[in-house]
């Protein structure tokens, strides 16, 4: 019942091409105190989506605000979709340290599949 | 089972710097936080430090930063911390703690500690 | 950083009598505070984490309540083995604090 769980809801979720990705990801503990992240990908290749902590995400929303000390909804909203984003989407808590904060737990993971967006119904001749 | 060795006694002379160490046994050392705590005599328990074996990271208390030192040395299942510029402020017990809770804040398991006395 | 205030500092009791030590934090930290008992010349060892949580073979009259910043450890029917020094600790960090603890005597 103490130990930290990464819980991420969906296997997978599907979106249009064009449109907003919601990724869910929550935590049941406050503790350990740290930063979480976001990658697409797992092993050393993964791609930095999210941070918590630092740096600019212009394409990437958070679902609720995440500076409120008790806050355990991390879950991000990724706009404008492109089949470049298909892959599988990892929600990791770290515990903070110096220099560099320490991986501590990753959610199961949310494979993200992308659909060709719907054409617009042409207007009749 | 989990153990924490730690040398019984280290004494100094003020200004000089001292290395104490302690050996880990028992378990997968690179995956537990190891935290440094310090008593005065007849004082109370004042946590110093961590540090996390797998990759070296630290947190200190503001008032260790430029005190101690942590590292370890993974090839011996060893973590040290060095004190520098020595006073008698510094004689005290240091002690090494680890295990499962040290991730959560908690110490489940607590070397002997090492008494250092800071004497001319 | 999160100061930790312990009381009372010192408490007499004797076998088989009910203690209480309180434990109140500077500011919330939710669930996550540890106990520890500490015997003279010893190492501390865990007695409770998480508040109320306790630890691998510690006795069953030992429990831990309290959450926000007002917490506390009670002994019922206290043994002899039982007295020595007690300490709060923060968990919601790093850095940890701990408390400057109480010291559970014979009367």
């Known amino acids: 019942e103490d130990e930290l769980q990464v819980i991420q809801p969906e296997k997978s979720v599907s979106v249009a091409a064009g449109e907003s990705a919601t990724l869910r990801c929550a935590m049941t503990s406050l503790i350990p105190v740290g930063p979480i992240m976001w990658f697409r990908g797992a092993g050393a290749g993964r791609e930095l989506i999210y941070n918590q902590k630092e740096g600019h995400f212009p394409r990437v929303t958070t679902v609720s605000e995440l500076t409120k000390r008790n806050n355990l909804d991390f879950s991000i909203s990724i706009s404008n979709i492109t089949p470049a984003d298909a892959g599988t989407y990892y929600c990791v808590k770290f515990r903070k340290g110096s220099p560099d904060d320490v991986e501590f737990k990753s959610g199961a993971g949310t494979e993200l599949s992308v659909r060709e967006a719907a054409l617009a119904p042409t207007a009749p001749l | 089972q989990v153990q924490l060795q730690q040398p019984g006694a280290e004494r100094v002379k003020p200004g000089a710097s001292v290395k104490m160490s302690c050996k880990a046994s028992?378990?997968?050392?690179?995956?537990?936080?190891i935290t440094w705590v310090k008593q005065r005599p007849g004082q109370g328990l004042e946590w110093i430090g961590d540090i996390y074996p797998g990759s070296g990271s630290t947190n200190h208390i503001e008032k260790f930063k430029s005190k101690a030192t942590l590292t370890v040395d993974t090839s011996s299942n060893t973590a040290y911390m060095q004190l520098s510029r020595l006073t008698s402020e510094d004689s005290a017990v240091y002690y090494c703690?680890?295990?499962?809770?040290?991730?959560?804040?908690?110490?489940?398991?607590w070397g002997q500690g090492t008494t250092l006395t800071v004497s001319s | 950083d999160i100061q930790m205030t312990q009381s009372p500092a010192s408490l007499s009791a004797s076998v088989g009598e009910t203690v209480t030590i309180t434990c109140r934090a500077s500011?919330?930290?939710?669930?996550?505070l540890a106990w520890y008992q500490q015997k003279q010349g010893k190492s501390p060892q865990l007695l409770v984490y998480t508040a109320k949580t306790l630890a691998e073979g510690v006795p069953s009259r030992f429990s831990g309540s309290g959450s926000g910043t007002q917490f506390s450890l009670k002994i019922n029917s206290l043994q002899p083995e039982d007295f020595g020094n007690y300490y709060c600790q923060h968990q919601y960090g790093p850095p940890f604090t701990f408390g400057s603890g109480t010291r559970l005597v014979i009367k």
């Open positions: 500011e919330n930290i939710y669930s996550y």
């Open positions: 028992g378990y997968t050392f690179t995956s537990y936080w």
């Open positions: 703690a680890t295990g499962y809770g040290s991730s959560y804040g908690y110490f489940d398991y």
